[in-house]
Interface confidence: medium
């Protein structure tokens, strides 16, 4: 599923991401835009043999199990395929664990490079939340 901007903002808010660990909803929507272009089925392969999955591009080396990433930790205790569902519950729950890990949203390279320090509220402007 490819979410609309406001549709995703509403879904993320319903799942409790607004101000989760101090990160406003706009940060999460911005991260999703530049990680996956709002596409829940996005997959991207990394040079270390791992793969990033879903709307927030969660990595198989650390967070989920795709059955083929050497030394996978699977810290979210889920199959990576669950992160590709049109229901973003699994991605949100795992993202909450990631953002609580110490580096905050710096764990997402796209957030660090494209969202951090910008007017992230623009990503939810005009949305009925």
């Amino acid at each position: 599923k490819v979410f609309g901007r406001c549709e995703l903002a509403a879904a993320m808010k319903r799942h409790g991401l607004d101000n989760y660990r101090g990160y406003s909803l706009g940060n999460w929507v911005c991260a999703a835009k530049f990680e996956s272009n709002f596409n829940t089925q996005a997959t991207n392969r990394n040079t270390d043999g791992s793969t990033d999955y879903g709307i927030l591009q969660i990595n198989s080396r650390w967070w989920c199990n795709d059955g083929r990433t050497p030394g996978s930790r699977n810290l979210c205790n889920i199959p990576c395929s669950a992160l590709l569902s049109s229901d973003i519950t699994a991605s949100v729950n795992c993202a909450k664990k990631i953002v609580s890990d110490g580096n905050g949203m710096n764990a997402w390279v796209a957030w660090r490079n494209r969202c951090k320090g910008t007017d992230v509220q623009a990503w939810i402007r005009g949305c009925r939340l």
Epitope: Q41, T43, G49, D66, G67, T69, P70, S81
Partner: antibody
Framework: QVQLQESGAEVMKPGASVKISCKAT????????IEWVKQRPGHGLEWIGE????????YYNEKFKGKATFTADTSSNTAYMQLSSLTSEDSAVYYC?????????WGQGTTLTVSS | DIELTQSPATLSVTPGDSVSLSCRAS??????LHWYQQKSHESPRLLIK???QRASGIPSRFSGSGSGTDFTLSINSVETEDFGMYFC?????????FGGGTKLEIK
Amino acid sequence: QVQLQESGAEVMKPGASVKISCKATGYTFTTYWIEWVKQRPGHGLEWIGEILPGSGSTYYNEKFKGKATFTADTSSNTAYMQLSSLTSEDSAVYYCARGDGYYCYWGQGTTLTVSS
Amino acid sequence: DIELTQSPATLSVTPGDSVSLSCRASQSISNNLHWYQQKSHESPRLLIKYASQRASGIPSRFSGSGSGTDFTLSINSVETEDFGMYFCQQSNSWPRTFGGGTKLEIK
């Protein structure tokens, strides 16, 4: 136990298309990548690409882009590979395998012969 | 693409001999190297994963070693059922690639 059952041998004419199937049993089909491998005598094993059945995400070896197309039907736990514009170079045995990085589980292979 | 070069192309041995098969990668692949045996008209069978881990049900006479670019599959006291083709495969990056194979034949 995990099993991959491929469709039977095919004899096709040059220019035609063929669709090979791979039915998976014994594990959660949507969770693992299905990989496709080509074997020709004297050419060893070649990785064609992969599909994640749960999402339909696909990756292709550049060499096979435009030649192979992967699909999957999660209701029947079956992955498919279509090969188009067949030539004699496509005559080979085609395997599906479960993608665990390594390939512990293989189909029995589908022999494709392209001949006029 | 990562190229895998296997040597020798053919190895002629007598049952009871011990042999070593080599697989060399064109760049470092850590331990992401796997070995397969294939007999005529059969699918490949996984022997060794991640350079040195024997797959389930594989006899202890098969062992693997190596890391980086140089890998070895060893067969201690070859049995008649071991004759066939042996392939290595890397899973360090895409596209996945295989070696050209070593044929183990009876002398």
